[in-house]
Interface confidence: low
């Protein structure tokens, strides 16, 4: 039979007021015969918390059934934790003896301290949208945690960020603490579908960090590129001109066609095509009547995107004699 070891795996146990605390203790041997007791503190003044053999302990329950012959788990649960319960708890094996049982071996002890979980991190982005290549700031806040030690990380699409500043308040002793971090993120043109994540790790979370997220789609504006093209074929007396608005975000877009400076058609973008990167494309068609047109017609496609200054693209219409004379649906 191997020598008895009393195993208390946790050095520190953080508990919350009003909750139940589980103090773990396992033994490596059933020998020697005798009970296991729990104490808070050491020495003559130690407080008996639980006695396997006898006594009434209304707030204490055992994790395993200690009446079972080969039980090796002497863990206990203490309910309705109060601040008065903090201290170091020892699991102690006694050897059956006369007139009293004799202390045989003690566990290393588990310190019980009050802990509080951090609140779910809240990530806030910039108030206004910004175009790619610019830097935007995101803030992350979490509150109400204890002890003070906490780890905060930032990620963009799974890649850890390094440009951030973090503060934990207050700096002195407190019942609970708060953390605030600001990360600077350079926007890329493909960031419509990107996400920033604030990850908070704390001892009370048992290795399962809390995460707050923000979508860069809320922070980015990708301005459109314009291309105005005259279609080669005529439709009756009309020439078809297209304005291709490409790679823009968000969707909000108004388009105006002008002919030699005179506004002739206004449109609001609808039935957009979505690109893989989350940006949008849209094409507007404009029919120009060329039956009595001069050769110096200038068409302008003007786009106002997301309330920004309008951008425009011009096209000098090329109407050849052949086009004037021959309709695309004419038969040879």
């Amino acid at each position: 039979e191997e020598e008895l070891q009393m195993i208390q795996p946790e050095k520190l146990l953080l508990v919350t007021v009003g909750k139940t605390a589980t103090l773990h203790c396992t033994v490596t041997s059933l020998l020697p015969v005798g009970p296991v007791l729990w104490f808070r503190g050491v020495g003559p003044g130690r407080e008996l918390i639980y006695n396997q053999k006898e006594g009434h302990f209304p707030r204490v329950t055992t994790v395993s059934d200690l009446t079972k012959r080969n039980n090796m788990d002497f863990s206990i649960r203490i309910s309705s934790i109060t601040p008065a319960d903090v201290g170091t708890y020892y699991c102690v094996k006694f050897r059956k003896g006369s007139p009293d049982d004799v202390e045989f071996k003690s566990g290393p002890g588990t310190e019980m301290a009050l802990g509080a979980k951090p609140s779910a991190p809240v990530v806030l982005g910039p108030a206004a949208r910004t175009t790619p290549e610019h830097t935007v700031s995101f803030t992350c806040e979490s509150h109400g945690f204890s002890p003070r030690d906490i780890t905060l990380k930032w990620f963009k699409n799974g890649n850890e960020l390094s440009d951030f500043q973090t503060n934990v308040d207050p700096t002195g002793q407190s019942v609970a603490y708060s953390i605030r971090s600001t990360a600077r993120v350079v926007l890329d043109p493909w960031d419509v579908r990107s996400q920033v994540i604030c990850e908070v790790a704390h001892v009370t979370l048992q290795g399962d960090p809390l995460r707050g997220t923000a979508n860069l789609s809320e922070a980015i504006r990708v301005p459109p590129t314009l291309e105005v093209t005259q279609q080669p074929m005529r439709v009756g007396n009309q020439v078809n001109v297209t304005c291709q608005v490409r790679k823009f975000y968000p969707q909000s877009l108004q388009l105006t066609w002008s002919e030699n400076g005179n506004v002739c058609q206004r449109e609001t973008a609808s039935t957009l095509t979505e690109n893989k990167d989350g940006t949008y494309n849209w094409t507007s068609w404009f029919l120009v009547n060329i039956s009595d047109q001069r050769d110096d017609v200038v068409l302008t496609c003007q786009v106002k995107h997301d309330g920004q200054l309008a951008v425009s693209k011009r096209l000098a219409l090329e109407v050849t004699v052949h086009q004037k004379d021959q309709s695309s649906d004419a038969t040879p």
Partner: antibody
């Protein structure tokens, strides 16, 4: 389904040897204390031997030094090597699983008959 | 070794009867007493452990009680399938030992 199936019984002469096997299915044999219990014809039950999860072994007085209990975790099997057999060892031998916490017998095999006779 | 003494050795009863079998340990065994049922030509079946806990699948007409040295098995309303031999066992220390058995027969 949790099951124990014994094999290896048969007729053997006094002084001879037999090896009983018990194949476990539906659970990991090494996680439990395992036992052999026997029943002579027309008689009651008699505990024979046990092997603990740590490999510790126990025997009833009449078989000490003659019987050896063992297990092979890879095959999920329990064995009882019986040497120097006597007529008094004639019995049905049962393989039994002990409970997780208190070693109370919960699962029994169907048994295998061992007859020691010249 | 701890001796387990069962009584009676045999018992005749009728369908519907309530019967009690007792078992006495030669020394205190806490509550580490178990009960088994065995029918002719079959392996024993586990009924009760730690004196009063029923194994899964065992009907509630079976009940056990006791601690220390004296234990009882009670069958509240006998059915034809309950006529068999019943054994008690101590498993507090090796060697584990069984009672000599109680044969329950139809009257």
């Amino acid at each position: 389904e949790v099951q124990l199936v014994e094999s290896g019984g048969g007729l053997v002469q006094p002084g001879g040897s037999l090896r009983l096997s018990c194949a476990a299915s539906g659970f990991t044999l090494s996680s439990y204390d395992m036992h052999w219990v026997r029943q002579a014809p027309g008689k009651g039950l008699e505990w024979v031997s046990a092997i603990g999860t740590a490999g510790d072994t126990y025997y009833t007085g009449s078989v000490k030094g003659r019987f050896t209990i063992s297990r092979e975790n890879a095959k999920n099997s329990l064995y009882l090597q019986m040497n120097s057999l006597r007529a008094a060892d004639t019995a049905v031998y049962y393989c039994v699983r002990g409970g997780v916490w208190d070693d109370a017998f919960d699962i029994w095999g169907q048994g295998t008959m061992v007859t020691v006779s010249s | 070794d701890i001796q387990m003494t069962q009584s009676p050795s045999s018992l005749s009863a009728s369908v519907g009867d309530r019967v009690t079998i007792t078992c006495r340990a030669s020394q205190g065994i806490n509550n580490y007493a178990a009960w088994f049922q065995q029918k002719p030509g079959k392996a024993p079946k586990s009924l009760i452990y730690t004196a009063s806990s029923l194994h899964s699948g065992v009907p509630s007409k079976f009940s056990g009680s006791g601690s220390g040295t004296d234990f009882t098995l009670t069958i509240s309303s006998l059915q034809p399938e309950d006529f068999a031999t019943y054994y008690c066992q101590q498993y507090v220390s090796y060697p584990y030992t069984f009672g000599q058995g109680t044969k329950l027969e139809i009257k």
